[in-house]
């Protein structure tokens, strides 16, 4: 029988009455148009909803928008459009919500053609009040908050000027012209690229990379011949044009661009690209596109300096620059990532790594599923996960994979079971152990979300017909109850719950359509009465993450340590609560070769944990470029994996000597840099 229909599935007592008392409908007095929703702050209950409606007139488009505010997680909304003087808000800029719990909101207004500058509405009290400010420029991008100080904003203008505000948008100053891209770094630093000749496009590959650490009082040129740059974790990356040809290479800095090293990665040509897939303070996953229009490339993982890279995964699916990749960080378990590869026959397969890119394998076939017609062998196949690429291809996939850091081990995704991703209608699968094992959770495509740190999973069937039923599970997707939240079905457009998965409220958004009109409507359901009591110690059980062989003393060791978690028992129907903190007990493991990546000049043959010298480098001195100086490496081929905490055990020798020689290949050496002050 289908999941959730087994005899052993106990029903949650009196849930219909409990949910009916906690279901709140709000009909918005709006023609349909579009709707966007933002949460303001964490655990504040404040939601802003912006509805916009475009009326195409003969010579122009007339726009109308309305702003609504809720302070009870969406149960009730108040029309606050008058706070923004009934101004039409530009949806392409979204609602710029300040970091952390600053309570700051910036809305960018539509202004008439001849105006000198744009207009913004600012709030610093969680959208209770707004201040109108006319800008001395027309914004090209949304206002960007400094992560360290929410009073500091930056924006690019349509004239390519870089504008900064130090008082939350009250006063603006243009600190530089001819700017292509600007990003906040750490400590209120701004990095940006500038062009000299004509435009960003024309100067691509001849841009300069600049830095200001004092909001535009002084500047330092930290790179030339720049194609693009990016920030990831503590790393600053720049792709730099080679002197001789049209190829470019990645350079990396860990000191805000003062010194640079050339990353030991392949160079790329004009039609290729680099992409930072994921980065933290320890390491980075870098995708390097293959030559030609192949749609795939190679994933490399870095060492702790972002300089030495190990090949992690071949034939990694990534369509074009800014295109689609299925690369997904499974945030519910350390070290786990899922992505897709393009096989030789042009089909797509899912791969998973449990050790931060060290090894990739196929996903284990779910116990309760049969292999589909993509499988060569009916008894041996894998689960293949639908992510961004499937969604871009308009396969019947309403949502990407979902995991939450505080719902330990839970991963939910659409998938098919076979030798490759199928074009047939997918089902929804769940893993409760971070991707090691999977179970079919729901038949057919669904929208899904996690509430109360995994205590409740909510799902709605993906259908072209109007819906009025929501499904929920209190046991990590084993058994499902259905609740009819309205008599009159609605055309469903989305599920909204507070980011962080700590809330017990879910909002179902959609629209009703009658003969003459259609209106936005939301239903907010509070599950607090389903989980009647707070969880106690007896409701939790000890779980060893990454456990594959309980007999082995090193079982659960990943990146040099193992972690035991306290996890909610599936049978416990109780509230983790908003203040729930994941309880984990780490313990250090002995080092083995698995805790080391292959050093510069070495590689791991397939299915071997030993690193061997690259044939083309055998007998050569291992020299590479570091901070613009030539370094000599004495190594037996191993370097500890970034973030690996193992101690004792295997300990390979490694020594780096400064050869006191300048690198000729480094385009970003310190003498090419200069400073200037305003």
């Amino acid at each position: 029988s289908a999941p959730g229909e087994d005899e052993e599935c106990g029903r949650v007592r009196d849930f219909v009455a409990k949910l009916a008392n906690n279901t709140h409908q709000h009909v918005f007095d709006d023609l349909r148009g579009s709707v966007s929703l933002s949460w303001v702050g964490d655990s504040t209950g404040v939601i802003l909803v912006l509805t916009t409606f475009h009326v195409p007139l003969v010579i122009m488009t007339f726009g109308q928008s309305k702003l609504y505010r809720s302070e009870d997680y969406g149960k009730n909304f108040k029309d606050i459009t008058d706070l923004i003087n009934n101004t039409f808000i530009r949806t392409e800029f979204g609602m710029a919500i300040g970091p952390e719990n600053s309570g700051k909101v910036v809305l960018t207004a539509e202004v008439s053609g001849g105006s000198r500058g744009g207009r913004i509405f600012r709030s610093s009290d969680f959208a209770k009040n707004f201040v109108q400010t006319d800008l001395p420029f027309h914004p090209l991008t949304q206002m960007m908050y400094s992560p360290q100080n929410s009073d500091y904003l930056l924006a690019l203008s349509t004239e390519n000027g870089l504008w900064v505000s130090k008082n939350f948008g009250g006063k603006w100053e243009e600190i530089h012209k001819a700017v292509c891209l600007a990003k906040w770094g750490s400590d209120n630093t701004i990095f940006f690229t500038t062009y000299a000749n004509g435009s960003c496009k024309a100067d691509l590959g001849a841009l300069e990379l600049w830095r200001t650490s004092d909001l535009g009082k002084s500047f330092k040129t930290i790179g030339v011949k720049i194609y693009s740059f990016g920030l990831g974790g503590r790393f600053l990356f720049a792709s730099v044009m080679a002197d001789k040809d049209t190829t470019r290479r990645i350079h990396v800095s860990t000191d805000q661009g003062d010194t640079w090293s050339m990353a030991q990665l392949p160079s790329v040509g004009q039609e290729q690209f680099y992409s930072i897939l994921a980065a933290n303070d320890d390491m980075v996953f870098m995708h390097v596109d293959e030559p030609g229009d192949t749609g795939f490339g190679t994933i490399f993982t870095s060492d702790d300096r972002g300089i030495v890279y190990s090949k992690s995964l071949d034939r990694h699916l990534y369509t074009t620059t800014g295109g689609e990749t299925d690369f997904t960080n499974v945030t519910s378990l350390r070290g786990v990532y899922i992505t897709s590869v393009l096989s030789e026959d042009n089909s797509i397969q899912t791969m998973i790594t449990f050790d931060q890119g060290g090894r990739w394998t196929h996903l284990r076939k779910p116990e309760n599923s049969e292999c589909d017609a993509t499988a060569k062998n009916k008894n041996e196949c894998s689960l293949h996960i639908h992510a961004s690429y499937s969604i871009s291809q308009k396969l019947n996939v309403p949502m990407a994979p979902l995991s939450e850091p505080n719902a330990v081990g839970i991963v939910i995704a659409h998938g098919s079971v076979g030798d490759a991703i199928s074009v047939m209608v997918p089902d929804v699968y769940i893993s409760d152990d971070g991707g090691y094992s999977w179970t079919k959770m729901l038949e057919g495509p669904h929208y899904y979300t996690i509430l109360d740190s995994g205590g409740i999973i909510v799902a709605i069937e993906h259908s072209s017909r109007p819906i009025n039923v929501i499904k929920f599970s209190t046991d990590e997707g084993q058994c499902w109850q259905t609740y009819t939240f309205t008599r009159d079905p609605i055309y469903f457009t989305g599920l909204a719950s507070e980011p962080g998965a700590r809330s017990m409220n879910i909002s179902i958004w959609g629209f009703t359509e009658s003969f003459l009109t259609s209106q936005w409507v939301s239903y907010t359901i509070d599950f607090k009465d389903i989980l009647e009591r707070n969880c106690e110690e007896k409701d939790y059980t000890i779980w060893l993450a990454h456990s594959t062989d309980p007999e082995d003393y090193e079982d659960g060791c990943i990146l040099g340590y193992k972690e035991q978690f306290l996890r909610l028992r599936k049978s416990s129907v109780c509230q983790n609560g908003r203040d729930y903190v994941v309880t984990k007990q780490p313990s250090i493991c002995l080092c083995s070769l698995e805790d080391f990546l292959c050093d510069f000049g070495y590689y791991r043959p397939e299915n071997d944990s030993k690193c061997v010298e690259q044939p083309e480098l055998k007998g050569h001195d291992l020299e590479f470029c570091l901070y613009g100086r030539e370094e000599h490496l004495t190594t037996n081929g191993y370097r500890k994996i970034p973030g690996d905490k193992c101690q004792g055990g295997v300990n390979p020798v490694r020594e780096v000597k400064d050869l006191k020689k300048k690198c000729t290949s480094n385009f970003l050496s310190p003498e090419k840099q200069n400073s200037k002050s305003n």
Partner: antibody
């Protein structure tokens, strides 16, 4: 030459099951998927599902899920389609058809569909009390 | 599932004339489309695959065009053996679905 030969006509009572066979010849049986399509009297064509002769894995249209079972015997180069819990509306001609492209989604280069290029002669199944 | 709609349901054409059959998909099927011909008492026969490529042995008077949601089968000069029912079929997303068919009859 390449051909698919199906079993003969069947008359069944409601609630019963029917098993139709389709024998392939003239090509390498395991290289091509096989679809089953049915056609009710005076109606259009309706796809029921597909089987991969290697491994025997299947994908069925939602409408037939739980009632249809497709199997194969590689040694006999034959695929079978069994439909259970028959009702009068299952009265139709059932065709097997070679389906070279299979059901795998394709990469950026796109998925080229080759169509159902070889069809069986059809098997008439009549469901009547 | 993707709904395929064929028009017209019946097309009356004189021999030697041109026939244009239309097929519309409820969402994009890219070029994953095939056309079939079926005569009374016979199994369908593949005419066009990949939206525009003629199958082996199909005369040049049959041509297919279109991609995405709008497709056309054109028979440039109808012969007596071309009077039949024509079906389009998508294989972009499962389940495969057929159009309702267009009957081409003698005027």
């Amino acid at each position: 030459q390449v051909q698919l030969v199906q079993s003969g006509a069947e008359v069944k009572k409601p609630g019963a099951s029917v098993k139709v066979s389709c024998k392939a010849s003239g090509y390498t049986f395991t290289k091509y998927y096989m679809s089953w399509v049915r056609q009710a009297p005076g109606q259009g064509l309706e796809w029921m599902g597909i089987i991969n002769p290697i491994g025997g894995s299947t994908s069925y249209a939602q409408k037939f899920q739980g009632r249809v079972t497709m199997t194969r015997d590689t040694s006999a180069s034959t695929v079978y389609m069994e439909l259970s819990s028959l009702r009068s509306e299952d009265t139709a001609v059932y065709y097997c058809a070679r389906d070279p492209s299979g059901i795998a989604a394709a990469g950026p280069a796109g998925r080229y569909y080759y169509g159902m290029d070889v069809w069986g002669q059809g098997t008439t199944v009549t469901v009547s009390s | 599932e993707i709904v395929m709609t064929q028009s017209p349901a019946t097309l009356s054409v004189s021999p030697g004339e041109r026939a244009t059959l239309s097929c519309r998909a409820s969402q994009s099927v890219s070029s994953n489309l095939a056309w079939y011909q079926q005569k009374p008492g016979q199994a369908p026969r593949l005419l066009i695959y990949g939206a525009s490529t003629r199958a082996t042995g199909i005369p040049a008077r049959f041509s297919g065009s279109g991609s995405g949601t709008e497709f056309t089968l054109t028979i440039s000069s109808l012969q007596s053996e071309d009077f039949a029912v024509y079906y389009c079929q998508q294989a972009r997303l499962g389940p495969w679905t057929f159009g309702g068919g267009t009957k081409v009859e003698i005027k």
